[in-house]
Amino acid sequence: VLEVYYTHLRCRCVQESSVFIPRRFIDRIQISPRGNGCPRKEIIVWKKNKSVVCVDPQAEWIQRIMEMLRKKSSSTPPVPVFKRKIP
């Protein structure tokens, strides 16, 4: 189980996974860009089983999903931190 918590840098991800997570197991995804005291982009996946996983932003599967989300929300202006519920 991957740990997620706040550090003095306000980064939350201690470990990152690149493993594909099927959509039916995902509750929501939070994408935090660099900044706000954390020098790296963080992607946090909340799963329906109540566990939380930090995903490597370079992982191919999450980039594909992010691209899909970008296309879906292209009509709305970007926000610095957002959560997307996975249908």
Epitope: V1, S18, V19, F20, I21, P22, R23, R24, F25, K47, K48, N49, S51, E60, W61, R64, I65
Partner: antibody, heavy 120, light 107 residues
């Protein structure tokens, strides 16, 4: 050590019913999705369906959902497959498998299989 | 349903050979693909998950690659115990589906 011990297979007549069981040990059964998969003679693996930990979500292969019912009893650490209106094409080896949703997201543990033969 | 097509029903090989099995999905499954091995009289065993990750205890002669619709499973140096049927499976979405299987046999 994780074990999935299957039982309940056997000979059943066309149109009949049968209930397969899969008893889990060595895992916190109530935390995991579980699946049923079968392999007919000379054929490949076919997914039957899956059930989530609290039984609130059950997904079936569309062609099988009207004749098979997947259930579980977490108090008994046991998964079930109720088969009804069976036909000769349901003759197969039936496997239960853990559908991991923590680390691998694939079927990482399998039962030994139980044979079902549909014949008059 | 997503159809997983394994182009070869069987493949002949020799001990020490490098062999690759291909699998094509009928639609994009991202990297939601696993590979299993089934020996006669045994249950399937998970070898590869998330298209390219080796499952615990799986020797490094087994590798997987691909994303989207095209996937490959490779054994870099076939051993006698590798003679079995290999299945790809997509777990991107339900219904989960398997390829028809590729039987690896000796020449």
């Amino acid at each position: 050590e994780v074990k999935l011990l299957q039982s309940g297979g056997g000979l059943v007549q066309p149109g009949g019913s049968l209930k397969l069981s899969c008893a889990a040990s060595g895992i916190d059964f109530s935390r995991y999705w579980m699946s049923w998969v079968r392999r007919a003679p000379g054929k490949g693996l076919e997914w039957i369906g899956e059930i989530n930990p609290d039984s609130s979500t059950i997904n079936y292969a569309p062609s099988l959902k009207d004749k098979f019912i997947i259930s579980r009893d977490n108090a008994k650490n046991t998964l079930y497959l109720q088969m009804s209106k069976v036909r000769s094409e349901d003759t197969a080896l039936y496997y239960c498998a853990r559908q991991d949703d923590y680390e691998y997201y694939a079927m990482d543990y399998w039962g030994q299989g139980t044979s079902v033969t549909v014949s008059s | 349903d997503i159809v997983m097509t394994q182009s070869h029903k069987s493949m002949s090989t020799s001990v020490g050979d490098r062999v690759s099995i291909t699998c094509k999905a009928s639609q994009d499954v991202n990297t939601g693909v696993a590979w299993y091995r089934q020996k006669p009289g045994q249950s399937p065993k998970l070898l590869i998950y998330s298209a390219s990750y080796r499952y615990t205890g799986v020797p490094d002669r087994f590798t997987g690659s691909g994303s989207g619709t095209d996937f490959t499973f490779t054994i870099s140096s076939v051993q006698a115990e590798d003679l079995a049927v290999y299945y790809c499976q997509q777990y991107y979405s339900t219904p989960l589906t398997f390829g028809a299987g590729t039987k690896l046999e000796l020449k």
